[in-house]
């Protein structure tokens, strides 16, 4: 006889998360970002794939493009021309790097309900976009830029020198895409479509990374990418502007580079149009502690662009690199000359400043021991921005409005008290003139997207509240999460701890540290996630901790720039310090502590394992950097300087994983990498493996053939299954 199972308690009807739940994306959430097309209208793709236009003020909606039309060309994306006469439909999406992809484009004429025939676009196209007004098209095909006055017209070829892997027009090369622009495009229409600015990248002299792509053929293919590693020759960049009405008149006109920038190696960092005849360019010295913002004006008489020295604004860091991860971009005010920009104040916190004439005379708009993170919109009377000021939690994001029409300017937190427990991490999307805006809350509760009136901040409607997800989670035993801080030697270490559902402080639990730790990153954020570590806590009873140490962002320059020219030291120290503090808390089994990380996190986890502290039993490094000499120049040199004797070669050599091969002898190490990683090359793990073999140190490894830095698709399932087995074995947990 067996006693009957009791089902009356809620605890008993609930189940733990499974690995299958995570791999199937069972508990993924949705967000709603309106595709704004005016002050009060937006487009959205409905559940049945119709493209619907919503008018907030009339409350009406209508389908502008049916799912039937979308399906007829297998479209996965669309773009409405600003004059609402045409829609481009994107199909045959083929991913290249992080942002870049090629696609086939069809133009649909809304006035007659037919696809535009004659002068069809070539395929595949690398980038295509409408002008901001009307229906001009700019596109990049085979590294050259073309212009169409209207979709049915023949194209005007703007550039002729484009060449695969050599000259890139209107699109970035690998390093600019990944490390500088963070976009797939490098062309920018002026506000009314009069001019088109574009970048030309010359990669002729850049060394090439080559790796095998195995595919299914008898012989593997070799992938060649011009990829400047630290200290190598960089791309040569030039910026041109062409008049799109009279493109052949004087042709593309080059925008001059500020003399103080042009005197040595430099980067172009961003372009911002101010008016149709005023443009703002940002440049950066190769040693990335000096940035110059240059405002240029069109000279009608000469048909050239003039960038007077009086309109050059210098931003310099004396304690680290310029900016945060990137140098911030300006948001211009209505006078078309003054602007708002985020940079470090005298106390070393990133804040909004108003620049009217010189940077020295900048007026500080926000201040405090917290940071302004993003300026969303500046209108005639308001400035909307996000910060982590509220309740002094650096891992939160709230949206604020500052009235700039009145004096003194008044500040209001738009989001702080909306759904206080559920929502502490917001972003926003504004319609024209900030007439309306959408708020997207990422957590810590279930994400929710709402629509608001731009004048009153009143909530108009819920756009997406993830009801299905809420219902699905009702019978799931989710782990508990807490965000707290440790004060150690004048350093504040914020951490997030993920605890098993029935956590009991009197018991001992295995601890897994998940680390990223890269410069200007933040792992401890008040966001919702049901992921692999949620499963490890829920089902496998592990405690997982994420720690933001020195080098991480949004807590001031002292913490951020602490790692300048010294990568691989303090990030590791701070993870170790945190682990020691966690052990002191009394519920960690100090014989079962592991660390894992991906990319920069793989580098940190490897160094932590090889720190010789004896704290870690095992660890995993996925796609780690192993030597900074192997990584991209733009990223690496920002934080490390150059690998030359008279600069920082010594620390480049001291900070490798290979130099610590001997120290892996007393830990279980799992090394994982994709063979087609275009970002952190397989070379990094190959060198770790070689060093470990040469030191006769045993370790485990897994490669993923033809997979890039993201290890996507079926590899993801294999990866997390494999890592789960490894951790359970390390922690002596039964399978």
């Amino acid at each position: 006889l067996r006693p009957s199972r009791v089902h009356n308690s809620e605890e008993n009807t609930m189940r733990a998360l499974t690995l299958k739940d995570i791999l199937n994306g069972t508990f993924s959430y949705k967000t709603f970002f309106p595709n704004w097309i005016s002050g009060q209208e937006y487009l959205h793709q409905s559940a049945d794939n119709n493209i619907v236009l919503y008018n907030i003020e009339t409350g009406q909606s209508y389908t502008i493009l049916s799912n039937r039309t979308m399906k007829s060309v297998n479209a996965s994306n669309y773009g409405l021309s600003p004059d609402r006469q045409f829609v481009y439909l994107e199909s045959d999406y083929s991913k290249l790097w992080r942002y870049s992809y090629t696609a086939t484009y069809y133009i649909y004429d809304l006035s007659n309900g037919e696809f535009v025939r004659g002068n069809e676009l070539p395929r595949p196209i690398q980038y295509l976009c409408w002008s901001p007004v009307g229906s001009k098209l700019a596109y990049v095909y085979q590294n050259n830029i073309y212009l169409k006055q209207r979709p049915g017209d023949p194209p005007f070829q703007i550039t002729f020198n484009g060449r695969e892997n050599k000259i890139f027009n209107g699109i970035p090369d690998w390093v600019y895409e990944e490390e500088m622009l963070a976009t797939k495009y490098a062309l920018w229409w002026s506000p009314n479509g009069k001019f088109l600015a574009y970048a030309e990248f010359n990669d002729t002299d850049i060394p090439v990374i080559a790796y095998s792509y195995y595919g299914d053929e008898q012989y593997p293919r070799t992938i060649n990418i011009p990829y400047p590693k630290a200290g190598a020759k960089n791309p040569v960049v030039r910026i041109f502007i062409i008049d799109t009405t009279y493109p052949a008149y004087v042709g593309p006109q080059e925008v001059p580079v500020p003399a103080m920038i042009a005197s040595s190696d430099y980067y172009f960092s961003w372009l911002t149009w101010v008016t149709d005849e005023r443009v703002c360019l940002q440049w950066l010295k190769r040693v990335q502690n000096v940035s110059v913002l240059s405002i240029c004006d069109f000279r009608e008489d000469w048909q050239t662009w003039d960038c007077p020295k009086t309109q050059e604004h210098i931003e310099e860091s004396r304690t680290g690199w310029a900016g945060g991860f990137f140098v911030s971009t300006p948001v211009f005010s209505y006078d078309a000359i003054s602007y708002y920009k985020i940079f470090s104040d005298k106390d070393g916190y990133k804040h909004i400043h108003y620049i009217k004439d010189t940077v020295e005379n900048a007026i500080q708009i926000t201040s405090g021991k917290w940071e302004a993170i993003n300026i969303f919109r500046v209108t005639q009377d308001s400035l909307f921005y996000s910060s982590n000021e509220f309740e002094e939690y650096p891992g939160r994001r709230n949206i604020y409005r500052i009235s700039i029409g009145s004096y003194p300017p008044s500040k209001k937190c738009v989001t702080c008290h909306l759904r206080k427990e559920r929502c502490q991490y917001y972003t926003a999307s504004f319609s024209d003139y900030a007439k309306y805006y959408a708020l997207v809350c990422y957590g810590p509760g279930i994400p929710i997207s709402t629509l608001h009136d731009g004048r009153t901040d009143q909530e108009i409607k819920i756009l997406e509240e993830n009801k299905e997800l809420e219902n699905a989670l009702k019978n799931i035993q989710l782990p508990k999460e807490e965000i707290k801080k440790l004060e150690v030697d004048e350093i504040t270490l914020w951490y997030k701890m993920i605890l098993p559902p029935q956590f009991d402080r009197s018991k001992k639990y295995p601890l897994l540290i998940q680390v990223y730790g890269g410069p200007c990153s933040q792992s401890v954020r008040s966001v919702f996630a049901v992921n692999w570590i949620s499963y490890l806590a829920s089902k496998e009873g592990m405690v997982i901790a994420l720690v933001d140490g020195r080098g991480t962002a949004f807590q001031g320059d002292k913490l951020l720039y602490a790692v300048y020219r010294k990568l691989g030291v303090y990030e590791v120290e701070d993870q170790i310090t945190a682990v020691r503090k966690f052990i002191e808390m009394g519920f960690i089994d100090e014989k079962r502590i592991a660390i894992w990380g991906w990319s920069y996190g793989g580098y940190v986890s490897s160094l932590a394992l090889a720190s010789g502290t004896g704290l870690f039993k095992c660890g995993i490094a996925v796609a780690p950097v192993s030597s900074w000499e192997y990584y991209a120049s733009v990223y690496t040199e920002r934080f490390m300087g150059l690998p030359t004797k008279d600069d920082n070669l010594e620390h480049y050599k001291n900070s490798t994983v290979m130099a610590r091969a001997e120290y892996f002898r007393n830990v279980d190490y799992l090394l994982i990498h994709g063979t087609a990683d275009d970002n952190v090359h397989f070379q990094n793990s190959a060198q770790i493996a070689k060093a470990l073999v040469n030191a006769q140190v045993d370790f485990q490894a897994m490669w993923y053939s033809d997979q890039n830095h993201g290890l996507s698709g079926l590899s993801t399932n294999h990866l997390y299954t494999h890592m789960t087995h490894f951790l359970k074995q390390c922690f002596s947990l039964s399978d």
């Epitope: 006055q149 023949p154 005007f156 009405t245 009279y246 052949a248």
Partner: antibody, heavy 118, light 107 residues
Framework: EVQLVESGGGLVQPGGSLRLSCAAS????????MSWVRQAPGKGLEWVSW????????GYADSVKGRFTISRDNSKNTLYLQMNSLRAEDTAVYYC???????????WGQGTLVTVSS | DIQMTQSPSSLSASVGDRVTITCRAS??????LNWYQQKPGKAPKLLIY???SLQSGVPSRFSGSGSGTDFTLTISSLQPEDFATYYC?????????FGQGTKVEIK
């Protein structure tokens, strides 16, 4: 389909004036540079004038500068050429043409004959 | 102004012949060169734009090449309807100029 129809040609005495019109249809007239090209009897083609999409920018051949004025009315989809101080050498068929990108003439009207003779 | 010189000024050819007309600019015009066909009493018709791009609806026997100062129009196999006058044209600095024309006649 794109159509350009010229009108206003005829016989005029030297020193006289004439106004040519060109009615455009089948395309978004306000978005394009428009132009006049002429062809004297038995001769080749000669560009006369062009006007930008908004009408604020114009160009003229040296042979007509100061005598001819190009204009447009985007609300009426019509292009004009005001010809003053006409000379015998202005005798030609005048074509209205769309000057795409300010570079090539992709659509032409059928032409209107202007004869300057006493 | 940029001068455009066409050669020959006239030519006689038979149906099926390969015909080549050249055009020289007095200074470099990059690829901004266009070709037109004109039949008696009719308006000119665009054949080739930007030196080598075939205008929509124009038969593929017409092709263009060249850049800088020297350009060529080729008719790979002359058809009866191709007997006409051909003009080259450039538009650098928004000052369009035409060649003097090449008359293609039946041999």
């Amino acid at each position: 389909e794109v159509q350009l129809v010229e009108s206003g040609g005829g016989l005029v005495q030297p020193g006289g004036s004439l106004r040519l019109s060109c009615a455009a249809s089948g395309f978004t007239f306000r978005g394009y540079i428009m132009s006049w090209v002429r062809q004297a009897p038995g001769k080749g083609l000669e560009w006369v004038s062009w006007i930008g999409p908004e009408g604020s920018r114009t160009g003229y051949a040296d042979s007509v500068k100061g005598r001819f004025t190009i204009s447009r009315d985007n609300s009426k989809n019509t292009l004009y050429l005001q010809m003053n101080s006409l000379r015998a050498e202005d005798t030609a068929v005048y074509y209205c043409a769309r000057l795409l990108y300010g570079t090539w003439f992709d659509y032409w009207g059928q032409g209107t004959l202007v004869t300057v003779s006493s | 102004d940029i001068q455009m010189t066409q050669s020959p000024s006239s030519l006689s050819a038979s149906v099926g012949d390969r015909v080549t007309i050249t055009c020289r600019a007095s200074q470099s015009i990059s690829s901004y060169l266009n070709w037109y066909q004109q039949k008696p009493g009719k308006a000119p018709k665009l054949l080739i734009y930007a030196a080598s791009s075939l205008q929509s609806g124009v038969p593929s026997r017409f092709s263009g090449s060249g850049s800088g100062t020297d350009f060529t129009l080729t008719i790979s196999s002359l058809q009866p309807e191709d007997f006409a006058t051909y003009y080259c044209q450039q538009a650098r600095l928004l000052l369009p100029t035409f060649g003097q024309g090449t008359k293609v006649e039946i041999k």
